[in-house]
Interface confidence: medium
Amino acid sequence: PRSIDVKYIGVKSAYVSYDVQKRTIYLNITNTLNITNNNYYSVEVENITAQVQFSKTVIGKARLNNITIIGPLDMKQIDYTVPTVIAEEMSYMYDFCTLISIKVHNIVLMMQVTVTTTYFGHSEQISQERYQYVDCGRNTTYQLGQSEYLNVLQPQQ
């Protein structure tokens, strides 16, 4: 069998809402994956499990089942959404994310995703991890790859 390639493309959109009383941030983060089947037979994408971490704490998980079948030598782009909650010991972030004197409230999140594919009864898991910028201050739609975290930018004084 040839490889099944999973490429994490990036954050597609992030929709934010707040609970003022609880000082809690709710972020619905939609991510995009490209899954390429390099085989001459179809493979089934059985499930996608994803989690999002902020500051080494898991803030959201998602699982999608029976997603799609990818034909021979074909590629499919799949979007999946992870609902996340930044609260409790991280409620200090509420102040940052809602501070109006900053326009872009970027936080760095670690996106982890595992894709399980099956073919002829055999299953295979492929995992990816990527750090991404997400704006926790407003609803944002990203061009693919735009949210990638490369290095921490130091503000110019």
């Epitope: 102040d95 940052f96 004197s101 872009v104």
Partner: antibody
Framework: QVQLQQPGAELVKPGASVKLSCKAS????????MHWVKQRPGHGLEWIGN????????HYNQNFRGKATLTVDKFSTTAYMHLSSLTSEDSAVYYC????????????????WGQGTSVTVSS | DIVMTQAAPSVPVTPGESVSISCRSS???????????LFWFLQRPGRSPQLLIY???NLASGVPDRFSGSGSGTAFTLRISRVEAEDVGVYYC?????????FGSGTKLEIK
């Protein structure tokens, strides 16, 4: 050096509208919000709203919704405020002022102001 | 909206003396990040407003160190030591913690 240039005066008839300009120079236009402030004769200052020239994101004082519309022209580095359905209450001096934008917390915000445009509404 | 109150419409002062101008806000302007989102402006007669103090206590560029700002979350003071004739004008406080930004009604500095 940083400059915000505004025309000196505008005379308009009641019910008409006017578009005030604020020409920015001497800095990166898209890196600073532009604020607009109203001052009626003998009165204090009233914040109208602001606009981010990089993406035209705006915030308005509720008192000016439907009255003021803020826009920018990035190419000419000019901010505009359109005032509609003018009445004598709109007779005032209108100032533009800049504030650092982007991921920067406001530091020396509103550090440069235009000279103001005096709008007189009279028939 | 946050209401900014400057109780004294005017303050008379003799040149060379010190003067304090006060301002109150209806809500604390102290953010949990440690910054207090208050400005002080001076508007000289027939001129545009000029930034004096930002974030309650920071002196803006080019402003003489005779000016200083202090305060708590809701009560603020602009102090001018050794007042000069050119300090005449109306002093405004302004909050920028929340939209809409709001100004105080102003305090006029008058030379005795």
């Amino acid at each position: 050096q940083v400059q915000l240039q505004q025309p000196g005066a505008e005379l308009v008839k009641p019910g008409a509208s006017v578009k005030l300009s604020c020409k920015a120079s001497g800095y990166t236009f898209t890196s600073y919000w532009m604020h607009w402030v109203k001052q009626r004769p003998g009165h204090g200052l009233e914040w109208i709203g602001n606009i981010d020239p990089s993406d035209s994101d705006t915030h308005y004082n509720q008192n000016f919704r439907g009255k003021a519309t803020l826009t920018v022209d990035k190419f000419s580095t000019t901010a505009y405020m359109h005032l509609s359905s003018l009445t004598s209450e709109d007779s005032a001096v209108y100032y533009c002022a800049r504030s650092r934008g982007g991921t920067y917390d406001y530091g020396e915000a509103m550090d440069y102001w235009g000279q103001g445009t005096s709008v007189t509404v009279s028939s | 909206d946050i209401v900014m109150t400057q109780a004294a419409p005017s303050v008379p002062v003799t040149p060379g003396e010190s003067v304090s101008i006060s301002c109150r806000s209806s809500k604390s302007l102290l953010h949990t990040n440690g910054n207090t989102y208050l400005f002080w402006f001076l508007q000289r007669p027939g001129r545009s407003p000029q930034l004096l103090i930002y974030r309650m206590s920071n002196l803006a560029s080019g402003v003489p160190d005779r000016f200083s700002g202090s305060g708590s979350g809701t009560a603020f003071t602009l102090r001018i030591s050794r007042v000069e004739a050119e300090d005449v004008g109306v002093y405004y406080c302004m909050q920028h913690l929340e939209y809409p930004f709001t100004f105080g009604s102003g305090t006029k500095l008058e030379i005795k």
